[in-house]
């Protein structure tokens, strides 16, 4: 059997493989060792017994989408049946005091691989026995602690595979310089040690995306905006736009990034090198926001034209493909960050990203101020309570609701929240009466709201003992 027979249900074309060469990966035309690594079809009854105590689930994730030329990282995590975990030695053990369907286990081990490897790897003391190999026959790498790594992961995409020895969690990074744009499929098959052979325990696949557009996200924040996710904002208050570029492999770290904004309100283009920008709309209406991000990155230089070729025949590509050693680096110029060795040659690649949004601008409450506080004298039955009137003004649209949150002096522990509808005239002057239980210092957050906005003001207030001589004090506003 060949790798593509085992790992995929379709045979990939050599043309596709040639156009998607992944550095360090091998062609899935290579032979698969079925004696060491048995192959089970989906639905084969043997899957049921491939793991003691249930089925192992593999979860495959990636940091897709990836900008072409950047690295994309895939992570595989194994989820064991209930009460099982991997210990420091790579053995699979039962968690202490954990009860599953079979009850508490007397044997601490699900799989004691340490004991197995000591029994089976005595050959010439090197540990390089004929079974410590990957499915294509390549030997396991002998870095420190390799014996504690008991899972074999075979990654497969674009007609190529990558083999990795690991524990219950592995990561693999792939450079996308030679990957065809668009959605691609990554498939992973996981085997576990089983004496002197291996047993398949899980298969998983996931779609990843390679793009030539910088993945751009924009968050928008505006003070007093009631719902930041509805793309409705307030007139006459600045909106803060913050651009997030999805670049987990830091491919654009050495790029010069420019942000070109068009706010759709005839204020022209605004170009900046800062990822945040503030803009105030002064008219109501619907506006089309457009952002273009340009990253000027060092790119690979096309090789200089070769010298005139001798007329003797050279081997065909079909031949060279067969002998392609995936562990040797690709041809010069394949590295996406290779810089020119030719003086003054411009080897810059411009990458672009786009963001577009339609935003609605409406009237809103722009500002709230407490202009006066008055202690209201209480009748005798409530000697411990104080009634205080807050005289409040606002600017912008007319509020329909007022809320007060009374909390401790640090403004962290809420003691009381009261919201009530209000009917305010055009002057936007209202009085809010609130009760304070006992003397002391309080933090008062007062918000005025309507459908689209929520404006806040805060003050610290000192409520005196019920001594008529002691005045009410605003600690600070």
């Amino acid at each position: 059997k060949r790798f593509h027979d085992v790992l995929g249900n379709e045979r990939p074309s050599a043309y596709m493989r040639e156009h998607n060469q992944l550095n360090g990966w091998s062609s899935d035309e290579n032979d698969w060792n079925e004696k060491l690594y048995p192959v089970w079809k989906r639905g084969d009854m043997r899957w049921k017994n491939s793991w003691k105590g249930g089925r192992v689930q593999a979860v495959l994730t990636s940091d897709s989408p990836a900008l072409v030329g950047s690295n994309i990282t895939f992570a595989v995590n194994l989820i064991f049946p209930r009460c099982q975990k991997e210990d420091a030695n790579g053995n699979i053990v039962y968690e202490k005091n954990c009860r599953n369907e079979a009850g508490l286990s007397a044997d601490p081990y699900v799989y004691n691989w340490t004991a197995w490897s000591e029994d089976s790897d005595g050959e010439n003391g090197t540990g390089q026995s004929h079974h410590n190999v990957f499915p294509d026959g390549k030997p396991f790498p002998h870095h420190p602690g390799w014996r504690r790594w008991n899972f074999i992961y075979v990654f497969h995409t674009l007609g190529q595979y990558f083999q990795k020895l690991g524990r219950c969690s592995v990561r693999v990074s792939v450079n996308t310089a030679n990957v065809t744009l668009g959605p691609q499929l990554m498939e992973v098959t996981v085997y576990r040690r089983h004496g002197r052979a291996y047993v398949p325990i899980a298969q998983v696949k996931d779609v990843y995306v390679v793009t030539d557009q910088i993945p751009v996200f924009v968050t928008m924040f505006q003070k007093n905006d009631r719902n930041s996710s509805d793309e409705t904002f307030l007139k006459d208050l600045p909106i803060m736009f913050d651009v997030l570029i999805h670049d987990p492999s830091h491919f654009l770290n050495y790029s010069t990034i420019n942000y070109k904004w068009s706010f759709g309100d005839n204020t022209g283009l605004f170009v900046s090198t800062n990822h945040t920008v503030n803009h105030t709309y002064v008219l109501n209406g619907t506006f089309s926001l457009n952002l273009t991000v340009k990253a000027a990155a060092p790119g690979p230089c096309p090789p200089p034209p070769p010298p005139p070729r001798p007329s003797k025949p050279t081997p065909s590509l079909a031949t060279t493909l067969k002998s392609y050693d995936s562990n040797t680096p690709g041809p010069a110029g394949d590295n996406p960050l290779e810089l020119s060795r030719i003086p003054d040659e411009n080897c810059q690649i411009n990458r672009y990203g786009h963001f577009q949004a339609t935003i609605t601008i409406v009237e809103g409450i722009l500002e709230v101020n407490i202009i006066q506080m008055t202690d209201v004298l209480m009748p005798v039955p409530w000697p411990e309570s104080s009634l205080i009137d807050f005289v409040v003004t606002c600017q912008g649209s007319i509020p329909t609701e007022v809320c007060t949150i009374i909390s401790d002096p640090t403004c962290e522990i809420t003691q009381n929240t009261v919201c009530s509808p209000v009917d305010v005239d055009e002057m936007c002057l209202l009085t809010v009466r609130r009760t304070f239980n006992g003397s002391g210092t309080y933090c008062v957050n007062l918000t005025l709201g309507d459908d689209t906005s929520l404006a806040l003001t805060s003050t610290l207030i000192s409520v005196p003992d019920r001594d008529p001589a002691s005045p009410l004090r605003m600690a600070n506003s």
Partner: antibody
Framework: QVQLQQPGAELVKPGASVKLSCKAS????????MHWVKQRPGQGLEWIGE????????NYNEKFKTKATLTVDRSSSTAYMQLSSLTSEDSAVYYC??????????????????WGQGTSVTVSS | DIQMTQSPASLSVSVGETVTITCRAS??????LAWYQQKQGKSPQLLVY???NLADGVPSRFSGSGSGTQYSLKINSLQSEDFGSYYC?????????FGGGTKLEIK
């Protein structure tokens, strides 16, 4: 929209060389391979070779390995094909074509999805 | 190199008829095949990719089929603008060779 612009005609002398150009617009030039195809009068299409517009990597038809040299200039989004030691056999229309890709399951598929108008090369003394 | 054999080399048909052009590969190309149309004095245009998928803007009277080594392009109810030459091309390996072409002429 995606366009590949080629000059209409070139008249060259036997033994000389000619450099044909193909200017791309309407797409990200470096994201696509560029192909070159030969068509002699009244004949079919013959694949010459292809170049990766991003890194300059090339693949050639064995038949054209000593005849054609493919290059790109990313700054102007232009692909070039130089034909050397020209003879009357090289008189033909030469097309550049973009290699398009289509998502397949599980692998992408390819086809030449956009062609230039072709440059007619006449080799004559 | 994979040889692509197209047949017939030419055919003469009337508007409204249905025609089928075939393309045989010298080895299995697993549906990695494209069809192009070329009108007199013009550059080729992509019709079909991956053996069966119509390219954008191609009328539905065109259809591609086949697998393994045998592929065909069918044109239902031929229109006057369909006359010209048709080529298949494989993308199984390098070089991606073309078929010899089929010339479709008005009867």
């Amino acid at each position: 929209q995606v366009q590949l612009q080629q000059p209409g005609a070139e008249l060259v002398k036997p033994g000389a060389s000619v450099k044909l150009s193909c200017k791309a617009s309407g797409y990200t030039f470096t994201s696509y391979w560029m192909h070159w195809v030969k068509q002699r009068p009244g004949q079919g299409l013959e694949w010459i070779g292809e170049i990766n517009s991003s890194n300059g990597r090339t693949n050639y038809n064995e038949k054209f390995k000593t005849k054609a040299t493919l290059t790109v200039d990313r700054s102007s989004s232009t692909a070039y094909m130089q034909l050397s030691s020209l003879t009357s056999e090289d008189s033909a229309v030469y097309y550049c074509a973009r290699l398009g890709y289509y998502s397949g399951s599980p692998y992408p598929y390819y086809a030449m999805d956009c062609w230039g108008q072709g440059t007619s090369v006449t080799v004559s003394s | 190199d994979i040889q692509m054999t197209q047949s017939p080399a030419s055919l003469s048909v009337s508007v409204g008829e249905t025609v089928t052009i075939t393309c045989r590969a010298s080895e299995n190309i697993y549906s990695n095949l494209a069809w192009y149309q070329q009108k007199q004095g013009k550059s080729p245009q992509l019709l079909v990719y991956a053996a069966t998928n119509l390219a954008d803007g191609v009328p539905s009277r065109f259809s591609g089929s086949g697998s393994g080594t045998q592929y065909s392009l069918k044109i239902n109810s031929l229109q006057s603008e369909d006359f010209g030459s048709y080529y298949c091309q494989h993308f199984w390996n390098t070089p991606p060779t073309f078929g010899g072409g089929t010339k479709l002429e008005i009867k």
